[in-house]
Structures are given as structure tokens and as C-alpha cells.
């Protein structure tokens, strides 16, 4: 892992005035033991609205690595394997919570942050605007 | 909001022996100010693999409300508006981090938890298993 240099301005973990602060145990409990992680691993390629996954890394964030989906085409793949521009590939986005080191480089102090990520793509019928 | 009764067994926020614990400021910073939250609000209906959104509420979790997608059909909607079972609607899943109150009902003590959620659905070509 990346070693983060300690910022001398980091707040004291015991500071009672630290705003709206809670203690969080970072030993992650994984509730997904019953699901098969490989189940959706090839959907990005088999979808009629395929996507590529891009690695987004930020050592000041936890988790430091997030994968972002980008739709490969504006249209969708039809039965012949061609792109049909009468349909639209669009990203399915989700707001997720991450932990941001605050102040920067502090090993034991974070702030909750909400970020929008694209998880994959879906094929939708376009909204057609009829011009008078 | 729901008021959580305080558990008398809650750890002391200043306990230096609390395992792998960090301080987290719950004043959420939202990085999504430039995005239009309504942009993808109707994709669930316009998709060729439409889905419904179900509210999952748990006061012991932060965030307490998570919306889960369930694909409406096994197949995908074709150009005629009918379900084509030669294609598959599949859930796009993502592992996300949430905070779980630990011990239960503690207002200032959490543990990171990883859960699998379905964000929406996409239409994929099935893997056909040819039987000898």
C-alpha cells in the first residue's frame, strides 16, 4: 500500500470538539459471501450497450481505487452486431460514499464524501423532440 | 430522522485500543454539484432491460436508505415493445461501502461494511451452452 506522510496539523483523535465525528472500525465486514462475483464480470462485453472500465486512483480517498464505466458507443449493438443509432447507450450512475482524508495525509482522520460513479451502461429508447 | 437508543455497551470514542479505528466527520461533502440528478431518473423505464427500484431501509446502517434495482423481465424489450427471451435482462451490480452501527444502536461508533447492490439492468446476449 501507499504510505501517507503524516500531516502535523492532523486533529487529535480524542478531540471532543471535532465536528459531528464518529469512530469507524476499518475492518470491513463483507456481506456478499453468498453471491458469485463472477456472475456479472463479462456483462460489460456482452451488453447491447457495452462499456469499458477505467481505473480511478486517489490515495487520499478510501477506497483508493474505484472503477468507472464509460459507454463504448452512442448507439446500441443490434442483432447484426452493428451500432444502431436509433437507440442510445447511457451510463447508469450511482451516488456512493467514500472516505476522504481530511486534513490531507492524515492517517486516522476522514470526512464522508458523496461521489457519482458510472457503474455500467444500458440501452434506452431516445426521447424524440418533435419540432413544430 | 430515526432516534437510535444509546447502547450502554458503546465503546468510548477516546478508547485507544479500539481496533483499526479512525475518526470520521459525517458532514458530507458532495462532489456531484455539476451533475443533473434527474438525468438518469427515467432510464429505468426507457431501457430495453427496464427495472423497478425498491427502497431498502435499515436504521442501523448509514446511509439508512438504499434503493435496489430489480429487472422487470428475464428477457429484453424488442422494437415491437414485446419481451424477447432470446436476450437477457441482467442486474448491474456494485459493491459499495456503508457504515454499520457496531455495537448496535451506538450513535458514534460504526464499522465499515461492504454490500452488493443492483444499480440498474442491462441487456446482454446469452451464453448458449451447446450440449453434446
Amino acid at each position: 500500500g501507499i504510505t501517507i506522510p503524516r500531516n502535523p496539523g492532523c486533529p487529535n483523535s480524542e478531540d471532543k470538539n471535532f465536528p459531528r465525528t464518529v469512530m469507524v472500525n476499518l475492518n470491513i465486514h463483507n456481506r456478499n459471501t453468498n453471491t458469485n462475483p463472477k456472475r456479472s464480470s463479462d456483462y460489460y462485453n456482452r451488453s447491447t450497450s457495452p462499456w469499458n472500465l477505467h481505473r480511478n486512483e486517489d490515495p487520499e480517498r478510501y477506497p483508493s481505487v474505484i472503477w468507472e464505466a464509460k459507454c463504448r458507443h452512442l448507439g446500441c449493438i443490434n442483432a447484426d452486431g452493428n451500432v444502431d443509432y436509433h437507440m442510445n447507450s447511457v451510463p447508469i450512475q450511482q451516488e456512493i460514499l467514500v472516505l476522504r482524508r481530511e486534513p490531507p495525509h492524515c492517517p486516522n482522520s476522514f470526512r464522508l464524501e458523496k461521489i457519482l460513479v458510472s457503474v455500467g451502461c444500458t440501452c434506452v429508447t431516445p426521447i424524440v423532440h418533435h419540432v413544430a | 430522522g430515526i432516534t437510535i437508543p444509546r447502547n450502554p455497551g458503546c465503546p468510548n470514542s477516546e478508547d485507544k485500543n479500539f481496533p483499526r479505528t479512525v475518526m470520521v466527520n459525517l458532514n458530507i461533502h458532495n462532489r456531484n454539484t455539476n451533475t443533473n440528478p434527474k438525468r438518469s431518473s427515467d432510464y429505468y423505464n426507457r431501457s430495453t432491460s427496464p427495472w423497478n427500484l425498491h427502497r431498502n431501509e435499515d436504521p442501523e446502517r448509514y446511509p439508512s436508505v438504499i434503493w435496489e434495482a430489480k429487472c422487470r423481465h428475464l428477457g429484453c424489450i424488442n422494437a415491437d415493445g414485446n419481451v424477447d427471451y432470446h436476450m437477457n435482462s441482467v442486474p448491474i451490480q456494485q459493491e459499495i461501502l456503508v457504515l454499520r452501527r457496531e455495537p448496535p444502536h451506538c450513535p458514534n461508533s460504526f464499522r465499515l461494511e461492504k454490500i452488493l447492490v443492483s444499480v440498474g439492468c442491462t441487456c446482454v446476449t446469452p451464453i448458449v451452452h451447446h450440449v453434446a
Epitope: N34, T35, N36, K38, R39 | N52, K70, C71, R72, H73, L74, G75, Y85, H86, N88, S89, V90, P91, Q93, S118, P126, I127, V128, H129
Partner: nanobody
Framework: EVQLVESGGGLVQSGGSLRLSCAAS????????MSWYRQAPGKERELVAT????????NYADSVKGRFTISRDDAKNTVYLQMNSLKPEDTAVYYC????????????WGQGTQVTVSS
Amino acid sequence: EVQLVESGGGLVQSGGSLRLSCAASGFTFSSYAMSWYRQAPGKERELVATVEIGGSSTNYADSVKGRFTISRDDAKNTVYLQMNSLKPEDTAVYYCNVDWKWYEVDDYWGQGTQVTVSS
């Protein structure tokens, strides 16, 4: 049209065994995780067991772990539930369906198969 036809139920004594079958048609069976559910009189339908795509993994309700085994045969578009060491509390109508965590399944329920365990 999606069809799920369950069979293999019956009356059995406590401690006995049964093997349920569910024949699926009308969709690409091999592409979906499949589950067995049950509904006892006056109770809500509950998840019993799930088998993932390709049979790669299985998952069971705590109440049946170690006694029931779910499996699938994609060549026959069939999912099975082997039930051993049956108890009176296993008495219910058993149904198969796709995994209801990820799909709206209300349109697909079959007629189910009755399992009755006498003490």
C-alpha cells in the same frame, strides 16, 4: 412464455427424504441463478436455496443448511432440491423461480409442489 413446473412433492415421515424437480421453459435457463422457495400455511413465502449460474456456488437458508442440496442441469433446463432429514416444520408448498433479489418474479410462479412431513 416463461413456464416453471415443479414436481416431486408428497407425504413423508419425519427424517425421510424427497427430491423435488423444476422444469423450466420459455427463457435461457442457463443464464440465470435459480432458487427454491416455500410457503407454509399462513406464512409468507421464503427463500430456501439458490444455485448460481453454472452451478458455481450455492446458498441456503439457515433452517435447511446441511439437510437440503440444490443443483441444476442446464442441459435439461431443470433445477433440483434434494431434501434429507425432513422435519414437520418443512411442510409447505415448494416453488422454484429466478433469484428474487435481482428480478421481479411475480409473473413467473408455477403451481408449486406440496411437501407434507408427518411426525
